[in-house]
C-alpha cells in the first residue's frame, strides 16, 4: 500500500508511517513501527505534559517562587502545570503570573472601584459628587457625605471628593 | 528488569518438529513486535521471523517460509516458534528480540537446536 | 533484498588504538534504519548504535556510528579490552528480510 501523507488525530507521520501520539502525562520514548506501538514513559516528578504529544522530555512544573511573593495555588499533575498565586497584598505583575507586586491603593480622592485579587491589581475610580474619600487605603470605598438634614443640622463646610461636608447647629436668629 | 527468556531448545531428528517459547517480563509484552534471529555455530547472525504486537502480521525469512510459524500469547506474556519439518542446515542458537525503531534493543540469552540423526 | 557486506573480516588491534569498521548496503537504506550490534562468545547480541548514528542506552560514548545511503561506518575510538568481540550491522528499513552483515571481529592484535 502506499505510504500515508496524513495521519488521524492523535497520531503523527514520522518516515512515511502513522504513530499514535503520547497521552498527556506521557513522553515520548520510541517511535512505532509497523510492528510495535509508539513506546510512551511517564513523566518524573515535578514534570508534565499537557498535550497528546512526541515531546522526548517533560516539562518541568512551574516553581512558586516565596521570594518574588509566589505561593502554590494548585499544584501541578502529570498533566497539568503548577498555578501560581501571589501572597495576600500582592497580585500578579502578567497572565504567567512570574513575580508579585503590591497592591495599589487608592489615594485620598478616590476610592476601590473593585478589591485586587491575586491576579489582578486594585481598580480607583475618582469620589463622584456627593462621595469621598479621605485616606489612602486598597480597601475603602468612597463614602456619601453625611445628609446634615437628616440630623436636623446645616452644612457649614461643603465637602469635597476628599472631605466631608461639616454640618452645624441651625441659625436660630433668622428673621 | 526488562528480559527475555528462550526455553524448548534441544537435540531433534531432521524431519521432526520442535517448539521454542520466549518469556517476557519488565515491559508490556502486548505492545511490542517481537523477532526471532538465529545463529548457526560459527556464523553470523540471520533474522528468522517477526510477529507485531497484536499477532496480526507475521513476515518470515524464505529459508523457513511454509516450515516455521511465529505466534504470541500476550495474555501469558510469551512468543513461540513452531518448527517443523527441521532441517540439518536449521541447527543454530535461537534468540528472541523486541522490536522498537532502534532496531532490536532487548535479547534473549538464546536455546540451542540441534538437527541430527 | 538488501545485502549488508561489513569489512574488513576481521580488525586486529591493541587497546588504546582507533577501531573503524564498515558497513555498505546493496541499496540505500531509508531513514538511516541501520542498527550496530556487539557480540561476545557465549552470549546475545547488544544493541550498540540505531538510526546510523543514535548511541543506544548505557553504551559508552567510545562508540559512534556515522554514514548514510549506502554507506555506515561504527568507531570506537580507544579500544578497551571488553571491546573485542565480534560487530554486526543491520538494515530495519526495508523488509522482509531484517538483513545483518557478515559480522567484523575485532582481535587483540
Known amino acids: 500500500p502506499e505510504p500515508p501523507t496524513a495521519c488521524r488525530e492523535k497520531q503523527y507521520l514520522i518516515n512515511s508511517q502513522c504513530c499514535s501520539l503520547c497521552q498527556p502525562g506521557q513522553k515520548l520514548v520510541s517511535d512505532c513501527t509497523e510492528f510495535t506501538e509508539t513506546e510512551c514513559l511517564p513523566c518524573g516528578e515535578s514534570e508534565f505534559l499537557d498535550t497528546w504529544n512526541r515531546e522526548t522530555h517533560c516539562h518541568q512544573h512551574k516553581y512558586c517562587d516565596p521570594n518574588l511573593g509566589l505561593r502554590v495555588q494548585q499544584k501541578g499533575t502529570s498533566e497539568t502545570d503548577t498555578i501560581c498565586t501571589c501572597e495576600e497584598g500582592w497580585h500578579c505583575t502578567s497572565e504567567a503570573c512570574e513575580s508579585c507586586v503590591l497592591h495599589r491603593s487608592c489615594s485620598p480622592g478616590f476610592g476601590v472601584k473593585q478589591i485586587a485579587t491575586g491576579v489582578s491589581d486594585t481598580i480607583c475610580e475618582p469620589c463622584p459628587v456627593g462621595f469621598f474619600s479621605n485616606v489612602s487605603s486598597a480597601f475603602e470605598k468612597c463614602h456619601p457625605w453625611t445628609s446634615c438634614e437628616t440630623k436636623d443640622l446645616v452644612v457649614q463646610q461643603a465637602g469635597t471628593n476628599k472631605t466631608d461636608v461639616v454640618c452645624g447647629p441651625q441659625d436660630r436668629l433668622r428673621a | 528488569q526488562v528480559q527475555l527468556v528462550e526455553s524448548g531448545g534441544g537435540v531433534v531428528q531432521p524431519g521432526r518438529s520442535l517448539r521454542l517459547s520466549c518469556a517476557a517480563s519488565?515491559?508490556?509484552?502486548?505492545?511490542?513486535?517481537m523477532h526471532w534471529v538465529r545463529q548457526a555455530p560459527g556464523k553470523g547472525l540471520e533474522w528468522v521471523a517477526v510477529i507485531s504486537y497484536e499477532g496480526t502480521k507475521k513476515y518470515y525469512a524464505e529459508s523457513v517460509k511454509g516450515r516455521f510459524t511465529i505466534s504470541r500469547d500476550n495474555s501469558k506474556n510469551t512468543l513461540y516458534l513452531q518448527m517443523n519439518s527441521l532441517r540439518a542446515e536449521d541447527t543454530a542458537v535461537y534468540y528472541c528480540?523486541?522490536?522498537?525503531?532502534?532496531?532490536?534493543?532487548?535479547w534473549g540469552q538464546g536455546t540451542m537446536v540441534t538437527v541430527s540423526s | 533484498e538488501i545485502v549488508l557486506t561489513q569489512s574488513p573480516g576481521t580488525l586486529s588491534l591493541s587497546p588504546g588504538e582507533r577501531a573503524t569498521l564498515s558497513c555498505r548496503a546493496s541499496?540505500?537504506?531509508?531513514?538511516?534504519?541501520l542498527a550496530w550490534y556487539q557480540q561476545k562468545p557465549g552470549q546475545a547480541p547488544r544493541l550498540l548504535i540505531y538510526?546510523?548514528?543514535s548511541l543506544a542506552t548505557g553504551i559508552p560514548d567510545r562508540f559512534s556510528g556515522s554514514g548514510s545511503g549506502t554507506d555506515f561506518t561504527l568507531t570506537i575510538s580507544r579500544l578497551e579490552p571488553e571491546d573485542f568481540a565480534v560487530y554486526y550491522c543491520?538494515?530495519?528499513?526495508?523488509?522482509?528480510?531484517?538483513?545483518f552483515g557478515g559480522g567484523t571481529k575485532v582481535e587483540i592484535k
Open positions: 519488565g515491559f508490556t509484552f502486548e505492545k511490542y513486535g
Open positions: 538510526g546510523a548514528s
Open positions: 543491520q538494515q530495519y528499513s526495508d523488509y522482509p528480510p531484517f538483513t
Open positions: 528480540a523486541r522490536d522498537t525503531s532502534r532496531g532490536h534493543d532487548i
Open positions: 541499496q540505500s537504506v531509508s531513514y538511516s534504519y
